[in-house]
């Protein structure tokens, strides 16, 4: 499942080049074990911005996918209680290239670690 | 107002095949995912199929993994759902129905069309 | 998978009184973006199923106020403050924050 969600994001990166979209997201540059699950939610939640600010039927789908295939392979730990971590609003604002090769780097994590 | 239109069930033998189509008018299709939902003779609903609005992902229970396709052809407003290897507990009503978007809405099945029916019997 | 467990199977009620259905998963339907997709449906004799409460408590469009839905995790409750005759039917719960998405078994609201 991580590998398809990684697929997924190199097709948004190619499908946002297409496109105009100056938005900057709150993006985890460096996670910490301990708060990965927390940093993957403020991922998921940035990317339904994208999704929305681009108004393309493709990114909505992809994004909508990569939510689901997520969502599926955290189920047995998405409600694991995180403590210590930053909130999605305390993070450094990023460009979306940034954003998404941040968010690779955290899927790697999941991919290391299951 | 939103119609949903199912058709295409009927009597087949087991490890037969069946194509249902639903056909979708009053509202934009593409903008739209769009589900398969099946309901026992028991009355238990089970889902069976989900699409994207794009039609490029798919998803499925174990149940149905890899004997059933779900499809769309957005040109012409309509959802298919092809049946192979069917079973007798494949014997149900199926529904389609339109699915509100998991990023814009909450992601819940809004309006079903009538069903068809298929039996699975020898 | 995630099991949904609807009680009770049948619910007598007079037309006028208060009906609670509950629905329990057997893991928190909360997903990894904090939302919780639990649904409640009713079918009436004869018709296809049709939304009522979507995210556990979000009324759909032209359903009245007398449908309220709550719960939280795994528990969840959907509740007719007065039951008129046109809310008889199979009401059932279902879940969409994981896949495969899963019904509960059905709750026949009936006439006491």
């Known amino acids: 499942n991580w590998v398809n969600v990684i697929s997924d994001l190199k097709k948004i990166e190619d499908l946002i080049q297409s496109m105009h979209i100056d938005a900057t997201l709150y993006t985890e540059s460096d996670v910490h074990p301990s708060c990965k699950v927390t940093a993957m939610k403020c991922f998921l939640l940035e990317l339904q911005v994208i999704s929305l600010e681009s108004g393309d039927a493709s990114i909505h789908d992809t994004v909508e996918n990569l939510i689901i295939l997520a969502n599926n392979s955290l189920s047995s730990n998405g409600n694991v209680t995180e403590s210590g971590c930053k909130e999605c609003e305390e993070l450094e604002e990023k460009n979306i290239k940034e954003f998404l090769q941040s968010f690779v780097h955290i899927v790697q994590m999941f991919i290391n670690t299951s | 107002e939103v119609q949903l239109l199912a058709s295409g069930g009927g009597l087949v033998k087991p490890g037969g095949s069946l194509k249902l189509s639903c056909a979708a008018s009053e509202f934009t299709f593409s903008n739209y995912a769009m589900s398969w939902v099946r309901q026992t003779p028991e009355k238990r609903l089970e889902w069976v199929a989900t699409i994207s609005r794009g039609g490029d992902y798919t998803y499925y229970p174990d149940s149905v993994k890899g004997r059933f396709t779900i499809s769309r052809d957005n040109a012409k407003n309509t959802l298919y759902l092809q049946m192979s290897s069917l079973r007798s507990e494949d014997t149900a009503l199926y529904y389609c129905?339109?699915?509100?978007?998991?990023?814009?809405?909450?992601?819940?099945?809004?309006?079903w069309g009538q069903g068809t029916s298929v039996t699975v019997s020898s | 998978d995630v099991l949904m467990t609807q009680t009770p199977l049948s619910l007598p009620v007079s037309l006028g009184d208060q009906a609670s259905i509950s629905c329990r998963s057997s893991?928190?339907?909360?997903?990894?973006?904090?939302?919780?997709?639990l649904e409640w449906y009713l079918q009436k004799p004869g018709q296809s199923p049709k939304l009522l409460i979507y995210?556990?408590?979000n009324r759909f469009s032209g359903v009245p106020d007398r449908f309220s839905g709550s719960g939280s995790g795994t528990d969840f409750t959907l509740k007719i403050s007065r039951v008129e005759a046109e809310d008889l039917g199979l009401y059932y719960c279902f879940q969409d924050s994981f896949v495969p998405y899963t019904f509960g078994g059905g709750t026949k609201l009936e006439i006491k």
């Open positions: 995210k556990v408590f």
């Open positions: 129905a339109r699915r509100v978007s998991m990023i814009t809405g909450g992601w819940a099945m809004d309006y």
């Open positions: 893991q928190s339907i909360v997903d990894i973006t904090g939302n919780t997709y």
